[in-house]
Structure formats: C-alpha cells, structure tokens
Amino acid sequence: IIDGYKCKEGSHPWQVALLKGNQLHCGGVLVDKYWVLTAAHCKMGQYQVQLGSDKIGDQSAQKIKATKSFRHPGYSTKTHVNDIMLVRLDEPVKMSSKVEAVQLPEHCEPPGTSCTVSGWGTTTSPDVTFPSDLMCSDVKLISSRECKKVYKDLLGKTMLCAGIPDSKTNTCNGDSGGPLVCNDTLQGLVSWGTYPCGQPNDPGVYTQVCKYKRWVMETMKTHR
C-alpha cells in the first residue's frame, strides 16, 4: 500500500496472507471456514495461508495449507477480466475475534462510497519496501465513466476503480487479491494498476465482487 497507514489492530479479521514458503505472494479474504477469496492472477500450485494476525510472519498466527484453488472459468490472462479465484483450505479455520469471515455484498456500492483497502504489499515503488504490519488506505469508488478516461478499453465491465483525486495512495506489489471493503462488505479484490505504483489520478483497479456472488456461492457448494 502506497501512502497508507498502519491498520487498527484486529480491524481486518478476514484479511489473509497467501504465502509461498514464508514469502508474501498475495493478499486474500476469508469468506468461510474453508474458503479464501483472492485474485485469479495469484494462482500457485499450493499456498500457505496466514490468518488472525496483522503481522506478516507472525509465529502465533494460524497457518493452514491449501492445495486446491478454483479460478473463475472466464479468467483471461490477456484481458484480465474475471480476476477472481477461490482457494480451499485443507482444514477449517478456528474462528475467533481475530479470525472472521467477511460479509459478501448484497448490492454493488455506488461511486463516491468510502472504502478501505488493506495489504502487506510494498509501501514504495518501483524500489520495494515490504512492511511487517498490515497497511490500510482509505479510498473512494470511482465511476466506470471516470475511470475509463484513464484506462480506456483496458477497463472491463466487472472491474471497479477506487482512489483519491490527486493523491498517491494506492495498492502495489503484494497487495493483489486483498480486500476493498465498503460499508462492512467486500466490494473489491485488488487486481491491477499503473506502475510505478502511486501515480496520482491513476486509480487502483479491482475485481467487482458484487458481480460474482453467485459464482462464489456455487463454487463453494460444488467443492464442499
């Protein structure tokens, strides 16, 4: 997260880190005791999932292996549409005040809505500085019409933009797949943006979760 702040401890109990060994690979969001939602571009063969801590590499955090993941069937490595994936944990998480599932959206929030994005991604770009603490950034949803002025045809119908005018605050390497939460519901998953990160008036681009609720529910049901 560029130009963000340290999240209030315990305020993001649904935030997970997808690790490759001990190294951050992507963010993710707990949606059920067996399931984590993340970006399709975060796919790996297997994952180490850290839950229940704001500190990356926290020895006291829950760590659960995941060997199965289900990309949206429409994910395109060319256009990056449908950049969403479910990761099935090999064992259920132990829910607590530090580990909770996020609320999936009942509706799509409108432009102008205040939201928070979080992650352990680099706080500097292009040279990287990875924080140990979970970082947050407060951003607002931007209409597709406004966002298309920047990204033109790169912006797909189920992509969502967020940012703050004239501000550098944005997501970056390592934040992928992490949550954009608006009014206590998951509205976005970090997908992409311009690079180096933090260029004012280049919004962060997210997968618009409200458009995928049926796919999420059906996929979890199918692979119970």
Partner: antibody, heavy 122, light 108 residues
Amino acid sequence: QVQLVQSGAEVKKPGASVKVSCKASGYTFTSEGIHWVRQAPGQGLEWMGSISASSGDTNYAQKLQGRVTMTTDTSTSTAYMELRSLRSDDTAVYYCARSAGYGARHWYFDLWGQGTMVTVSS
Amino acid sequence: DIQMTQSPSSLSASVGDRVTITCRASQSISSYLNWYQQKPGKAPKLLIYGASSLQSGVPSRFSGSGSGTDFTLTISSLQPEDFATYYCDQWYSTPPITFGGGTKVEIK
C-alpha cells in the same frame, strides 16, 4: 545484484529443438513475469511470448504457437524457452526480459538478459 | 494486432544535435508506449515508459511525448554514447507486445 543471466550460444540443425535458460537473481522471481524476445541478424525485436513465474500462465505469439514452450523452475529461479522444429529463419539472438508492473497487468521491460545466439544451419 | 511504425528507419546526426524519432500506432494505445535504446551486441535498455516518464538513471536529455497514436522520442543534445538503435513498443493491447521497426542513429 538484480540480473538475468542466459545460457550460452547454440548451433542447431533444421528440424531440431533448442532450449534456452534464463536465471534470475537479486529479486523475487515468482513476483514477476518473464518474456522472451528475439532479434534476427540485422533485424528488429520480435516478442515471442511470456510466462508468469508463479502461476505458470503463458501467452505465446500466434506465429510461434505449437512450436514454442515456456516454463519456469521456481526452485532455481530459472525460466526456459524451448523452440522446436527449427528453421533457418529462427536464427536469432534470443533475449529473456522481466516485465514491470503489479497485479494482473504489466507495462514495460525493465530488465533484460544478455542474449543467447541460436544459429540454425545444415 | 496493433502495428507500430517508426520513422525514420535511420538518421545521421552530429554531436550536439537535437534528434527526434517518431512512433505511430495503428490504433489508439493511450499512453502505454515505451522507448528502448540498443547498442550493437547488447540487450535493449529502457529509456522512457508510459510515453513520457524517464526511467531511473537515464539522462534528462532524453524525453518522450505523445498519446493516442502519435509519439515522439527526443534527444535534446546528442552525445557520442547515444549513437544506437531506438525501439518503441506498446503494452496497451497485449498480448502480443508489438515493437516498432527501429531507428538507427548514426554519426554524420
């Protein structure tokens, strides 16, 4: 030191295959994409394809589809490009290059290997 | 696929000259265009990304401009080490990434 180091020059007969390696060091290999670009003698640059080091996702140039395979070995931070059924017009310097960006989309090549000369001759 | 056309294909210039190279896309690519410099026997090197942003460590005599379909690389005062071939590429509609044909800058 951040670098991509490629394997040495190759001489191959028409119809044979070649496999070029590209070893990354000084950065987290699995967080970036590796592309392959070739340059025939005295000619311009031609994009061949790319691979995501973490997911293994590939995209290949249409004209090479079916003849090229790109792979990675994350344990050694090495990318490979294999080209089969070689023809004389495959004679070129083959470069690996790292793409810069974050998340699903990348924007430019910010690091290149030194190049590997592949000569196809009977 | 988007075609990238560079002009001129070669030019002769003297040290201290202002040099301009152009790159035209077959359709709009917004500002997702980059410029590279390649010297004989060497790999290309990034100069400019996003049409106008100077890559770290590149001398300020290099500049880029343009958006949509027409782009320019300018060397404000040519130095001996700038004699090389210059390429543009586009990352708007990818894959494939497409390169311009190159412009060779030679000593007059």
